[in-house]
Interface confidence: medium
């Protein structure tokens, strides 16, 4: 059974390589009863969704950059 069928997680797997310029926004979902793991869901500029690895240094930088740009807006 996939993760999605075992818990109500939205990230079945994570996209490894993604360029920050392709990302429009990022949503970080904290663990909860619906899903035991932190999930990072990116909305891409083409409108599609992708799950990113929250442990990846690049993803951490992307999240930090997105959060900072939100604060400055």
């Amino acid at each position: 059974a996939s993760v999605a069928t075992e818990l109500r997680c939205q990230c079945l797997q994570t996209l490894q390589g993604i360029h920050p310029k392709n990302i429009q926004s990022v949503n970080v979902k904290s663990p909860g009863p619906h899903c035991a793991q932190t999930e990072v869901i990116a909305t891409l500029k083409n409108g599609r969704k992708a799950c990113l690895n929250p442990a990846s240094p690049i993803v951490k930088k992307i999240i930090e950059k997105m959060l900072n740009s939100d604060k400055s807006n």
Partner: antibody, heavy 125, light 107 residues
Framework: EVQLLESGGGLVQPGGSLRLSCAAS????????MSWVRQAPGKGLEWVSA????????YYADSVKGRFTISRDNSKNTLYLQMNSLRAEDTAVYYC??????????????????WGQGTPVTVSS | DIQMTQSPSSLSASVGDRVTITCRAS??????LHWYQQKPGKAPKLLIY???NLESGVPSRFSGSGSGTDFTLTISSLQPEDFATYYC?????????FGQGTKLEIK
């Protein structure tokens, strides 16, 4: 054709029990989460419970926690809702719904995209 | 629990009108929101998933938008078969919750 068919509803006295069934066909039942949603007469939709594809994870609304049990038999393509200690406020039409929808290879969404016709439950003395 | 509030509760409109229904979440739910249509005596039907995606077979006059806490369902030109009750639903976290519904009636 993808189909869900509920059964088991009826009239029961307060404090009594009832077991609802939902027979699924037309899709790989074991791959998808399922939910029960109810609708009291003249009222809106209220989510009751959900279960993962394998049956390993279950979720309940506070209003039914400890009284209702959701389960599934993937070999029979059937979803169940065991309802105990029934109250007048449990009177409603009960729908089972499939939570479908793989959107992208790296992202999954849960939407109730297929519904049964509903089975009425009346709790009254 | 996440509360979903729809407005208006009821709405009278005419065939051909443009209609907008709003749904507000008590906390941010990203775009983890769906819209359903229900006709009397029938089961609900999925219209829009993930805030803005049209379910297969649903007419293009239906559209959804929003993210975070504020969402809208728009019907660009009402048809006779659109008179029904509409519900939003969040799946950001359990318990899953629905809005109280918006009843769309003929003026």
């Amino acid at each position: 054709e993808v189909q869900l068919l509920e059964s088991g509803g009826g009239l029961v006295q307060p404090g009594g029990s009832l077991r609802l069934s939902c027979a699924a066909s037309g899709f790989t039942f074991s791959e998808l989460s399922m939910s029960w949603v109810r609708q009291a007469p003249g009222k809106g939709l209220e989510w009751v419970s959900a279960i993962s594809g394998s049956g390993g994870s279950t979720y309940y609304a506070d209003s039914v926690k400890g009284r209702f049990t959701i389960s599934r038999d993937n070999s029979k393509n059937t979803l169940y809702l065991q309802m105990n200690s029934l109250r007048a406020e449990d009177t409603a039409v009960y729908y089972c719904a499939r939570e479908g929808g793989r959107l992208e290879p790296y992202y999954y969404y849960y939407a109730m995209d297929v519904w049964g016709q509903g089975t009425p439950v009346t709790v009254s003395s | 629990d996440i509360q979903m509030t729809q407005s208006p509760s009821s709405l009278s409109a005419s065939v051909g009108d443009r209609v907008t229904i709003t749904c507000r979440a008590s906390q941010s739910i990203s775009d983890n929101l769906h819209w359903y249509q229900q006709k009397p005596g029938k089961a609900p039907k999925l219209l829009i998933y993930d805030a803005s995606n049209l379910e297969s077979g649903v007419p293009s006059r239906f559209s959804g938008s929003g993210s975070g806490t504020d969402f809208t369902l728009t019907i660009s030109s009402l048809q006779p078969e659109d008179f029904a009750t509409y519900y939003c639903q969040q799946y950001y976290s359990t318990p899953l919750t629905f809005g109280q519904g918006t009843k769309l009636e003929i003026k």
